[in-house]
């Protein structure tokens, strides 16, 4: 994939961040060890990442969350990565889903969810999850990134 | 990635060792169903994989292992992802943190890493883990690898 | 890897299907939103991956389950990516293995497989599970791919 | 940075009560739980009780359910345990715990101790 300049490299890297809020969208930003290797990918309202150039692209997230059973909703938690095309609807691409540990008060689990997708110029790819406030933001917990084919 | 003689593939993947050294990071073998594409990319005193060339790498790690509440810490199982750069300090690229079971004797887990990185020529990679006794090492269940975007 | 007629891109990633056949190999099918690059790589019978080009891929799996541990027998649910290469014995990729959870009536959990290996023209990989009636079908939760580097 | 400072702690006798306090302060985006955890010489550090922010549930340990409970008030970021009937075995450092910004904070401790 090292590429001449009609092919460049694009790839991105990007952390969690918390925030105050209330959507179930997980919010991201450039900062630690995150990669954004040109102009063609980008991070948009810290919350998704677009590209601009159509082809195949893994896409990947890790979500480590701390959640108690008793405290929660029978639902177990869920992370979604999502796909939103210019003037298409939002599609899930890809889902994982954990039940709530009996730890007390929290016990944490990991998920990571990949795939290839095709995607066209405009489109973004974001994360949804069922709780944010459950959502793990140490160093290198959670994390979100895309790779062109 | 087809490349040509100045662009040959990258890519490694190793297959986890019991080892009866004390410390925390984990230990690789070239065995079994390996990857080591050529010389650009090596497997050092079984621990770390380094790389002779900078760019973009997707990174991971897959760790396996059996625990107990009872039996462990309260702190979680947590498998780090780290990077150690010439010169510089080690850093946490990826974790992942994983409860303990109350599963008896112990409750296996799969814990998976991802993600994309720049890496400077002479960069290595090696995976830490909270307790390594608790790690499986049958076929297939802990593995470590990169590729070169 | 945007790549000439000569080396052009593959890539596939299929969605898991129900099936009332009783084998542990998981079913999948090119519907929702999969991909398949060309005839390079094709899904064969609805169970495994099939490529004609000789080369590194990173292949992966991701299957969601929900279980028991009461209505299960001892041992974890485990996921394995295996490999058939025309005239070898199949053999085990990667594995992952989660212990049943304690909720009832079953608890959900997500697996992720990935890694890169060699593949010669005409191998297959496909995923087996200890128990398919226990996988999770619902839109993204279970899937399975491969590009080649 | 956020901080957990807990208050309410001393010496009370057996059968007696205290309330304590902890407050989170700083930039506070997210709060799943507040709680408390103890620690008594030469032992493990234990879950005592959590309130979790979204719904008001709470959670105990076995060994106080019935003589403790766990409140807060979520405009002031701060939780309260009030401790009733209180035994010997109930002296420890009591820490008070939370998952604030998506991350274990911990306060610096607060002793209690339960003798005649």
């Known amino acids: 994939m090292q590429k001449g300049d009609q092919n460049p490299q694009i790839a991105a890297h990007v952390i969690s961040e918390a925030s105050s809020k209330t959507t179930s969208v997980l919010q991201w930003a450039e900062k630690g060890y995150y990669t954004m290797s040109n102009n063609l990918v980008t991070l948009e309202n810290g919350k998704q990442l677009t590209v601009k150039r159509q082809g195949l692209y893994y896409i990947y997230a890790q979500v480590t969350f701390c959640s108690n059973r008793e405290a929660s909703s029978q639902a177990p938690f869920i992370a979604s990565l999502c796909l939103k095309s210019p003037g298409r609807f939002e599609r899930i691409l890809l889902r994982a889903a954990n039940t709530h540990s009996s730890a007390k008060p929290c016990g944490q689990q990991s998920i990571h969810l990949g795939g290839v997708f095709e995607l066209q110029p405009g489109a973004s790819v974001f994360v949804n999850v069922t709780d944010p406030s459950q959502v793990s933001h140490g160093t290198g917990f959670t994390s979100f990134g895309l790779l062109k084919l | 990635m087809q490349k040509g003689d100045q662009n040959p593939q990258i890519a490694a993947h190793v297959i986890s060792e019991a080892s009866s050294k004390t410390t925390s990071v984990l230990q690789w073998a070239e065995k079994g169903y390996y990857t080591m594409s050529n010389n650009l990319v090596t497997l050092e005193n079984g621990k770390q994989l380094t790389v002779k060339r900078q760019g973009l790498y997707y990174i991971y790690a897959q760790v396996t292992f059996c625990s107990n509440r009872e039996a462990s810490s309260q702190a979680p199982f947590i498998a780090s992802l780290c990077l150690k750069s010439p010169g510089r300090f080690e850093r946490i690229l990826l974790r992942a943190a994983n409860t303990h079971s109350s599963a008896k004797p112990c409750g296996q887990q799969s814990i998976h890493l991802g993600g994309v990185f720049e890496l400077q020529p002479g960069a290595s990679v090696f995976v830490n883990v909270t307790d390594p006794s608790q790690v499986s090492h049958g076929t297939g269940f802990t593995s470590f690898g990169l590729l070169k975007l | 890897m945007q790549k000439g007629d000569q080396n052009p891109q593959i890539a596939a990633h299929v969605i898991s299907e129900a099936s009332s056949k009783t084998t542990s190999v998981l079913q999948w099918a090119e519907k929702g939103y999969y991909t398949m690059s060309n005839n390079l790589v094709t899904l064969e019978n609805g169970k495994q991956l099939t490529v004609k080009r000789q080369g590194l891929y990173y292949i992966y799996a991701q299957v969601t389950f929900c279980s028991n541990r009461e209505a299960s027998s001892q041992a974890p649910f485990i996921a394995s990516l295996c490999l058939k290469s025309p005239g070898r014995f199949e053999r085990i990729l990667l594995r992952a293995a989660n212990t049943h959870s304690s909720a009832k009536p079953c608890g959900q959990q997500s697996i992720h497989l990935g890694g890169v290996f060699e593949l010669q023209p005409g191998a297959s990989v496909f995923v087996n599970v200890t128990d398919p009636s226990q996988v999770s079908h619902g839109t993204g939760f279970t899937s399975f791919g491969l590009l080649k580097l | 940075e956020v901080q957990l400072v807990e208050s309410g702690g001393g010496l009370v006798q057996p059968g007696g009560s205290l309330r304590l306090s902890c407050a989170a302060s700083?930039?506070?985006?997210?709060?799943?739980?507040m709680g408390w955890f103890r620690q008594a010489p030469g032992k493990e550090r234990e879950f005592v009780a959590a309130?979790?922010?979204?719904?008001?549930?709470?959670q105990y340990a076995d060994s106080v359910k019935g003589r403790f409970t766990i409140s807060a008030d979520n405009s002031k970021n701060t939780a309260y345990l009030q401790m009733n009937s209180l035994k010997p075995e109930d002296t420890a450092v009591y820490y008070c715990?939370?998952?604030?910004?998506?991350?274990?904070?911990w306060g610096q401790g607060t002793l209690v101790t339960v003798s005649s």
């Open positions: 309130i979790y922010w979204s719904n008001g549930k709470t």
């Open positions: 715990a939370a998952w604030l910004n998506g991350g274990n904070r």
């Open positions: 700083g930039r506070i985006f997210s709060t799943y739980f």
